[in-house]
Amino acid sequence: EEELQVIQPDKSVLVAAGETATLRCTATSLIPVGPIQWFRGAGPGRELIYNQKEGHFPRVTTVSDLTKRNNMDFSIRIGNITPADAGTYYCVKFRKGSPDDVEFKSGAGTELSVRAKPSAPVVSGPAARATPQHTVSFTCESHGFSPRDITLKWFKNGNELSDFQTNVDPVGESVSYSIHSTAKVVLTREDVHSQVICEVAHVTLQGDPLRGTANLSETIRVPPTLEVTQQPVRAENQVNVTCQVRKFYPQRLQLTWLENGNVSRTETASTVTENKDGTYNWMSWLLVNVSAHRDDVKLTCQVEHDGQPAVSKSHDLKVSAHPKEQGSNTAAENTGSNERNIY
């Protein structure tokens, strides 16, 4: 009779993560008597995958009933495949021996490759806000994919970016891989509503790439412009001075009025108006009783925006002359007001 052969008909098997892999193996003879075992890898470090008589293998089932007297089908199924299961699997026939069974013949091996989807890309921006014209870095990370080939693109508001660097790790063979990319983005004043998108394409995604986004509203700081104007007389000896705070973001803003360098009033921006580009405007009024002053008054509007050093704008109020209109509110959208009397 011809000597037993162990046949593994599939040189390779490709399985998606989470699915079941079927590894086929048949023997050409019932002799010699002895069990079949499955291993991953070869040599002394090989890993036992299945032993039909002994050991615990909860993920493995046999395709046929190995207890049937004339069974020569030793195929197995491995459930819930992960990238860690990738490797070459050998079906090995043992003959009964004493004290231990002796390896008799091995199949040629079946290479199991696992396709695993990348995780959803996570985009993170700089820790601190930056102002327009500055360049900021965004990172994008995705993990756990296999095979290694992957494509990553960056977009800002739908426009593809070119200034980025990407690494796929590890460089050598691995059960799964990770991608890390850093893109440089130049901020503009119009970026409050902008989005940065990281797009990852992989064979497991069937042409439907994964995207991760970051809103530039979390990254940008648009400093305000200030304008202090004197309004027409409201009543005898009273002058209304406004401080218009324009085009700022984020909303966190504190305004202080100073009369001749002395703090007169401090308030926090509340009823702001939003511009189309996402920035805010705000206006504060100060009612000054001119008769309370003998000399000219220097009024200063001081603004602290988003924890940054204060910026200020001053206006000189002449007391000697009869108060008259010295300016007007020309910005139609500046309707927010905070009126206080100072006596």
């Epitope: 008597v33 002394p44 470090g45 090989r46 890993e47 036992l48 039909q52 008589k53 002994e54 050991g55 615990h56 293998f57 009933d65 190995l66 207890t67 009964k96 004290p99 231990d100």
Partner: antibody, heavy 114, light 108 residues
Framework: EVQLQQSGAELVKPGASVKLSCTAS????????MHWVKQRPDQGLEWIGR????????KYNPKFQDKATITVDTSSNTAYLQLSSLTSEDTAVYYC???????WGQGTTLTVSS | QIVLIQSPAIMSASPGERVTLTCRAS???????LYWYQQKPGSSPKLWIY???NLASGVPARFSGSGSGTSYSLTISSMEAEDAASYFC?????????FGGGTKLEIK
């Protein structure tokens, strides 16, 4: 549900023999080996041997080679452990264990005493 | 035969404490064939960890196993009262199959 039901406690005189049984249910009896393990009071575990119910092939721990005989009756899905020439050293709990090492019988207490 | 030596033979641990039990083999054992069991008084042993590092069904995630060659360990990341038991390592890499002498783990 997989179950290994072992025979009840035994009190035996020194020099005698005893045959312990282990009846399997809930799985194909010929699928895997059946092992026997000894545990003396407050001691560790000792592997006695195993049998392949499919063909009756046995392997023993050399220490128990002359003490233990493992057999099976596939018609009743039962494995047996026969212990001979009993001494006080054989006083122990004996477990039958399915080849997957997950399923253990409840144990049979053997007391050897005159 | 492969002799398995467990240490310590007995130990106490406080709740929340990290515990490591070791098992040394007299000759190399392939990691696929190294198992651990938990046994409580009056009960049969339960398979606890198989193939060195895989937790058996129902075993809490605070348990882990590691090792290769002749050195293996079972670790409890944060000891709980219900973990008080005896733990045995076991090899079925070669005949005769052998067990370690066990570690009795008590709660302080």
């Amino acid at each position: 549900e997989v179950q290994l039901q072992q025979s009840g406690a035994e009190l035996v005189k020194p020099g005698a023999s005893v045959k312990l049984s282990c009846t399997a249910s809930g799985f194909n009896f010929e699928d895997t080996y059946m092992h026997w393990v000894k545990q003396r009071p407050d001691q560790g575990l000792e592997w006695i041997g195993r049998i392949d119910p499919a063909d009756g092939d046995t392997k023993y721990n050399p220490k128990f080679q002359d003490k233990a005989t493992i057999t099976v009756d596939t018609s009743s899905n039962t494995a047996y452990l026969q212990l001979s020439s009993l001494t006080s050293e054989d006083t122990a709990v004996y477990y039958c264990v399915r080849g997957n090492y997950v399923n253990w019988g409840q144990g049979t207490t053997l007391t050897v005493s005159s | 035969q492969i002799v398995l030596i467990q240490s310590p033979a007995i130990m106490s641990a406080s709740p929340g404490e990290r515990v490591t039990l070791t098992c040394r083999a007299s000759s190399s054992v392939s990691s696929s064939y190294l198992y651990w069991y938990q046994q409580k008084p009056g009960s049969s042993p339960k398979l606890w960890i198989y193939s060195t590092s895989n937790l058996a069904s129902g075993v809490p995630a605070r348990f882990s196993g590691s090792g290769s060659g002749t050195s293996y360990s079972l670790t409890i990341s944060s000891m709980e009262a219900e973990d008080a038991a005896s733990y045995f390592c076991h090899q079925w890499y070669s005949y005769p199959r052998t067990f370690g002498g066990g570690t009795k783990l008590e709660i302080k």
